[in-house]
């Protein structure tokens, strides 16, 4: 695994091929999670930020930017969208959490919570995922669509199997995240496919 502290994945072009596979041995279904990362893009169209599919299940967990100021979370093919006033283009720190027992999903943008939404109460997110950055999967690890591809930079990505309390979300935003047990930017197992370059993070 690699410590990517102070670095980002750069996706320099629109494509249907360029992506990064994130590898995790997630063995049991997710009842809760929190995902945090930084992103910087000047795309004004819709694009995928984090695509998590399981065998036979599309959009099992997907973080998707619909347009400037609109972030969507898909859980088990169901979707909620939260809105925020944001500058464009500008770097952003995104956290999203979801809790099965209540169905509550919450985005945090640059350390600020958006309006809570609810979806898929009681659902468990399937384990053994294919996780892709840079493309939106329409199958298990493939079937990409150029029009949903990400162009820009992604870094500081962490994923926990719990809903983090606000103080821990703020710690992640401020650059001092808790150790993460699903994906951890400081100990990341990944595969680069296509034209993706690792570069220093210069925009925080």
């Amino acid at each position: 695994h690699t410590d990517l502290s102070g670095k980002v994945f750069v996706f320099p072009r629109e494509s249907v091929t360029d992506h990064v596979n994130l590898i995790t041995p997630l063995e049991k279904p997710l009842q809760n999670f929190t995902l945090c990362f930084r992103a910087y893009s000047d795309l004004s169209r819709a694009y995928s930020l984090f695509s998590y599919n399981t065998q036979g299940r599309d959009n099992e967990l997907l973080v998707y930017k619909e347009r400037v100021g609109e972030y969507s979370l898909y859980i088990g093919r169901h979707k909620v969208t939260s809105k925020v006033i944001e500058k464009f283009p500008a770097p952003v720190h995104i956290c999203v959490s979801w809790e099965s027992s209540s169905g509550i999903a919450e985005f945090w943008i640059n350390g600020t919570p958006l309006v809570k939404k609810g979806l898929r109460q009681g659902y468990f997110v399937e384990a053994q995922p294919k996780i892709v950055l840079g493309q939106e999967q329409d199958s298990y690890g493939g079937k990409f669509d150029r029009s949903q591809s990400f162009v820009g930079e992604i870094g500081d990505l962490y994923m926990w199997d719990s809903v983090l309390p606000p103080e821990n979300i703020l710690s992640a935003y401020q650059g001092t995240p808790l150790p993460a047990n699903i994906l951890d930017w400081q100990a990341l197992n990944y595969e680069i496919r296509g034209y993706v370059i690792i570069k220093p993070l210069v925009w925080v």
Epitope: H1, D3, L4, S5, N181, D184, A187
Partner: antibody, heavy 119, light 107 residues
Amino acid sequence: QVQLVQSGAEVKKPGSSVKVSCKASGGTFSSYWMHWVRQAPGQGLEWMGMIHPNSVNTNYNEKFKSRVTITADKSTSTAYMELSSLRSEDTAVYYCARRNDYYWYFDVWGQGTLVTVSS
Amino acid sequence: DIQMTQSPSSLSASVGDRVTITCKASQNVNSNVAWYQQKPGKAPKLLIYSASYRYSGVPSRFSGSGSGTDFTLTISSLQPEDFATYYCQQCNNYPFTFGQGTKLEIK
């Protein structure tokens, strides 16, 4: 099979420093966080800090931050832990340990190095 | 720092006994707990990770459970080689912290 081999026992005077080494073999040293844990005689385990040899990123337990320095030499696959301003309470066995592939647990340990602080 | 409190601190048991050791965290650590076994003069060995997963090569008589603040290590049928000291560890927050240990002795 990964192995961690530590340097030998040390006897030190109060106020001095000690530097313990931990040499890795049989694996990719630079890809794993290396941790240091100590154990005073008859006591429990205490995490001191960690280093990632590739990035040279470190993280220390605040309790030791002012006195401990963890370094790594990729060319020799060796991690080091230096503890300064030694006092009698620092008498302990010092272990290096490797982070597991996917989780923040320690799956490979060195054999330990006894550091005795005595005037 | 998160305190990990083990109980009992020592325990006498016989070969074949079922033994349970508990570990209580001072705050929620989710399932981010490991259990280690240590024999005198030796380094600790990883037994259980993520509260309930047996590490590679660990006999099936060892099992772990719990989440949040309360965790349990169970040895279903004690073998002679199991007499040792057992430690829990949390890796939910920095600094990582260990319990004070439970010494398992032969009755």
